[in-house]
Amino acid sequence: QNASRGRRQRRMHPNVSQGCQGGCATCSDYNGCLSCKPRLFFALERIGMKQIGVCLSSCPSGYYGTRYPDINKCTKCKADCDTCFNKNFCTKCKSGFYLHLGKCLDNCPEGLEANNHTMECVSIVHCEVSEWNPWSPCTKKGKTCGFKRGTETRVREIIQHPSAKGNLCPPTNETRKCTVQRKKCQKGERGKKGRERKRKKPNKGESKEAIPDSKSLESSKEIPEQRENKQQQKKRKVQDKQKSVSVSTVH
């Protein structure tokens, strides 16, 4: 390895060769490289029960190179580390460990979460949403005319998706009942005849009651506040006809 060790090896093994392979400055048949050419790193490679000296331009995975006056050598990273700058700073951990402040941890500290893609401990990111956009025009079956009862919808955007441990996003869609403008449909705008046209007029208070947007319900993940059984929904309708209630998509 270093100069003095090289001399010891030379005494032990008279067959030291100066015509060495692969970057060796001096070598022996038994021990392989004893010293390296300038800038190359000395490393010990295990072959069966024996360790052989090799000279490398960069150190293998799990090792880092250090330059001393008498030797450039490969030094082992810490046991849980795959790639490191030195013993203090790991840059990639072994499988099952997470990188945090240059160290490898089996669990991330409080306030951080494990990113299983990068295998790092990262800050928990909570959901962020924009302000609500304005309500859409009041429509029934896509038409904005000819019917007294319809629905209107408003949406907001997700600005920041949450990380695994982050707070879930609040609803991004809201739909409520509304009164369609009392204007006659033009030719081709007419809605379907039949049941809908014969329905009796709603009470005044019913014109702004929120109803579920079936599409948004299908695509939603429920959050606890949104879970209601049919009985509760009926009860709520009776009790609070005049409130605007949201049923929304959760991301």
Partner: antibody, heavy 116, light 107 residues
Framework: EVQLVESGGGVVQPGRSLRLSCAAS????????MAWVRQAPGKGLEWVAT????????YYRDSVKGRFTISRDNSKNTLYLQMNSLRAEDTAVYYC?????????WGQGTMVTVSS | DIQMTQSPSSLSASVGDRVTITCRAS??????LAWYQQKPGKSPKLLIY???SLIHGVPSRFSGSGSGTDFTLTISSLQPEDFATYYC?????????FGQGTKLEIK
């Protein structure tokens, strides 16, 4: 938490000796190469000496070779710097530091003043 | 020994300024370069290693670049706590040597 605490500094006459100590805690001392780095008043940083993790090899800057000796006691987690034949130009704050290519962790330093 | 020369030796700047400190090596040191920050009466603190790798906890306004013999430390937007002395250090060769330092002062 890594802690390095130097002691042993003081005022000494030229030609006399001084022994600095550095008590280490918060890391596996016997795994790390250690060094002394000094800083003369109002000047820059200057590496002085390094000892490898097991104490088997030591390295010195030319101006202190033969006068300073770096040593370590891994059972006591302590690094030493024996300074003999001190000169006025050795006046500085002496820091002990982990030395693994870079100087990652530093002590608070101990002042050595060489003056008659 | 490899000589490390920093410029400027001192520099006055204001909070919010972008600041660049240069370090030149007397011979090729590849990417074996580190930067340290030292505040008055305190020990130095490692900021950057391998030219541009930031130590964890060091703000991202600090960055390093260069290779071979010419290197720079850049602070993109100076903060009050950044006023200090900065040193470069090469670890390609023994003895490991430092630049003479760049003192960053408030204008």
């Amino acid at each position: 938490e890594v802690q390095l605490v130097e002691s042993g500094g003081g005022v000494v006459q030229p030609g006399r000796s001084l022994r600095l100590s550095c008590a280490a805690s918060g890391f596996t001392f016997s795994d790390y190469d250690m060094a002394w780095v000094r800083q003369a008043p109002g000047k820059g940083l200057e590496w002085v000496a390094t000892i490898i993790y097991d104490g088997s090899r030591t390295y010195y800057r030319d101006s202190v070779k033969g006068r300073f000796t770096i040593s370590r006691d891994n059972s006591k987690n302590t690094l030493y710097l024996q300074m003999n034949s001190l000169r006025a130009e050795d006046t500085a704050v002496y820091y002990c530091a982990t030395h693994d290519k870079t100087f990652d962790y530093w002590g608070q330093g101990t002042m050595v003043t060489v003056s008659s | 020994d490899i000589q490390m020369t920093q410029s400027p030796s001192s520099l006055s700047a204001s909070v919010g300024d972008r600041v660049t400190i240069t370090c030149r090596a007397s011979e090729d040191i590849y990417s074996d370069l580190a930067w340290y920050q030292q505040k008055p009466g305190k020990s130095p603190k490692l900021l950057i290693y391998d030219v541009n790798s930031l130590i964890h906890g060091v703000p991202s306004r600090f960055s390093g670049s260069g290779s071979g013999t010419d290197f720079t430390l850049t602070i993109s937007s100076l903060q009050p706590e950044d006023f200090a002395t900065y040193y470069c250090q090469q670890y390609d060769n023994y003895p490991n040597t430092f630049g003479q330092g760049t003192k960053l002062e408030i204008k």
